[in-house]
Interface confidence: medium
């Protein structure tokens, strides 16, 4: 039901990385505008992105209030220039999104190698603890703060002169690995939540190699 000159939104999709969360939908509006509402299972609907001609709405501010809640959104369609107009059932057309639980589903952003330091035949590789938009006590939490021990990092490392990769894992943000003295190594890391069923892994970080600026070397 609904007025003939509005169409319901479709293909409602959550796009979320490190809790930055945007709802996207189709179609591009022709003579219509959209308003989005978001709710938890037990909560009231809250309106966002009022009468927009966009086909996306940033819902980060709502979902970061509690990333373990399950959220539902809906997109209302209104005739452009007449947003009070409703469908024949007395309501504007709307479409529901799939449910979304940020903690379980947000994509892990590409990590960054913060530094590496060689001491003799050991190299300490540190992963940047990326800040999220999740707040506690007025401070932004890091990815590690939010996920705790659910989050691990996998390090891939190899001699610059060969392609044979080795791996190491940590549930902190640091690796301590053994290397051959006098050899240069390259590193890449990946964030992983092993116990997830979806979106378990991030993309690999940019490769960093010894002998370039990021590292620090101390021969013992």
């Amino acid at each position: 039901s609904g007025t003939t000159n509005t169409v319901a939104a479709y293909n409602l999709t959550w796009k979320s990385t490190n809790f930055k969360t945007i709802l996207e939908w189709e179609p591009k509006p022709v003579n219509q505008v959209y308003t989005v509402q978001i709710s938890t299972k037990s909560g009231d609907w809250k309106s966002k992105c009022f009468y927009t001609t966009d086909t996306e709405c940033d819902l980060t501010d709502e979902i970061v209030k509690d990333v373990k809640q399950t959220y539902l959104a809906r997109v209302f369609s209104y005739p452009a220039g007449n947003v009070e107009s409703t469908g024949s059932a007395g309501e504007p057309l709307y479409e529901n999104s799939p449910e979304f639980t940020p903690y379980l589903e947000t994509n892990l952003g590409q990590p960054t190698i913060q530094s590496f330091e060689q001491v003799g035949t050991k190299v300490n590789v540190t992963v940047e603890d990326e800040r999220t938009l999740v707040r506690r006590n007025n401070t932004f939490l890091s990815l590690r703060d939010v996920f705790g021990k659910d989050l691990i990092y996998t390090l891939y490392y190899w001699k610059s002169s060969s392609s044979g990769k080795k791996t190491a894992k940590t549930n902190t943000n640091e690796f301590l690995i053994d290397v051959d003295k006098g050899e240069n190594y390259c590193f890449s890391v990946q964030a992983v939540i092993p116990s997830r069923t979806v979106n378990r892994k991030s993309t690999d970080s940019p490769v960093e190699c010894m002998g370039q600026e990021k590292g620090e070397f101390r021969e013992i």
């Epitope: 903690y103 659910d150 092993p194």
Partner: antibody, heavy 118, light 107 residues
């Protein structure tokens, strides 16, 4: 199908040690923390500790820290809980449980009854 | 460690009744609450996680709600097979701790 199969019942004397095993199947063993929970007769549930099968790193309930040791054998997908210096109040059913993402225990072993009696 | 106080410790209700169990945390645990069902001689079974999410395969008559320190578990229409002891557990901060349990019986 996820399964956690525990070793059989044990009867021990005070001061002895017991080692309970928990064999996991049906999932990636190194991808989930394994927890140990005990339940004394007619009592509630008490968390003992957890181990990361990927790294072997453990976290213990302070109450048991001096007496419990958690280990894993990745080659057999088996977790172990050893409790030493047993006393009568350690008589309980001991469960292994897989911790799901975010904290809850989604799968439990069938339980191992440990009786401590002189 | 965070203490979990569960009430009542036991209750008796008729088939079809709405049953409510409460759990209070000694400090805020956000949404970090799970609820378990344990039948005599059996292992506990996860019903609810993140305070309000039903675990896979759990019937819709079981529900949970709450945030912070006060949580509620509800069986909307008690069935004979629901006779069991129910436990809350906080999984917000280690050491993970359980409530004392609520034994549910049929009148």
């Amino acid at each position: 199908e996820v399964q956690l199969v525990q070793s059989g019942a044990e009867v021990k004397k005070p001061g002895a040690s017991v080692k309970v095993s928990c064999k996991a199947s049906g999932y990636s063993f190194t991808g989930y923390y394994m927890n140990w929970v005990r339940q004394a007769p007619g009592q509630g549930l008490e968390w003992m500790g957890e181990i990361n099968p990927s790294t072997g790193g453990s976290t213990y309930n302070q109450k048991f820290k001096a007496r419990v040791t958690l280990t894993v054998d990745q080659s057999t997908n088996t977790a172990y809980m050893e409790l030493s210096s047993l006393r009568s109040e350690d008589t309980a059913v001991y469960y292994c449980a897989r911790r799901e993402l975010g904290g809850p225990f989604g799968y439990w072993g069938q339980g191992t009854t440990v009786t401590v009696s002189s | 460690s965070i203490q979990m106080t569960q009430s009542p410790s036991s209750l008796s209700a008729s088939v079809g009744d709405r049953v409510t169990i409460t759990c209070k945390a000694s400090q805020s645990v956000s949404q970090g609450i799970a609820w378990y069902q344990q039948k005599p001689g059996k292992s506990p079974k996860l019903l609810i996680y993140f305070a309000s999410n039903r675990y896979t395969g759990v019937p819709s008559r079981f529900s949970g709600s709450g945030y912070g320190t006060d949580f509620t578990f509800t069986i909307s229409s008690l069935q004979p097979e629901d006779i069991a002891t129910y436990y809350c557990q906080q999984d917000y901060s280690s050491p993970w701790t359980f409530g004392g349990g609520t034994k549910v019986e049929i009148k």
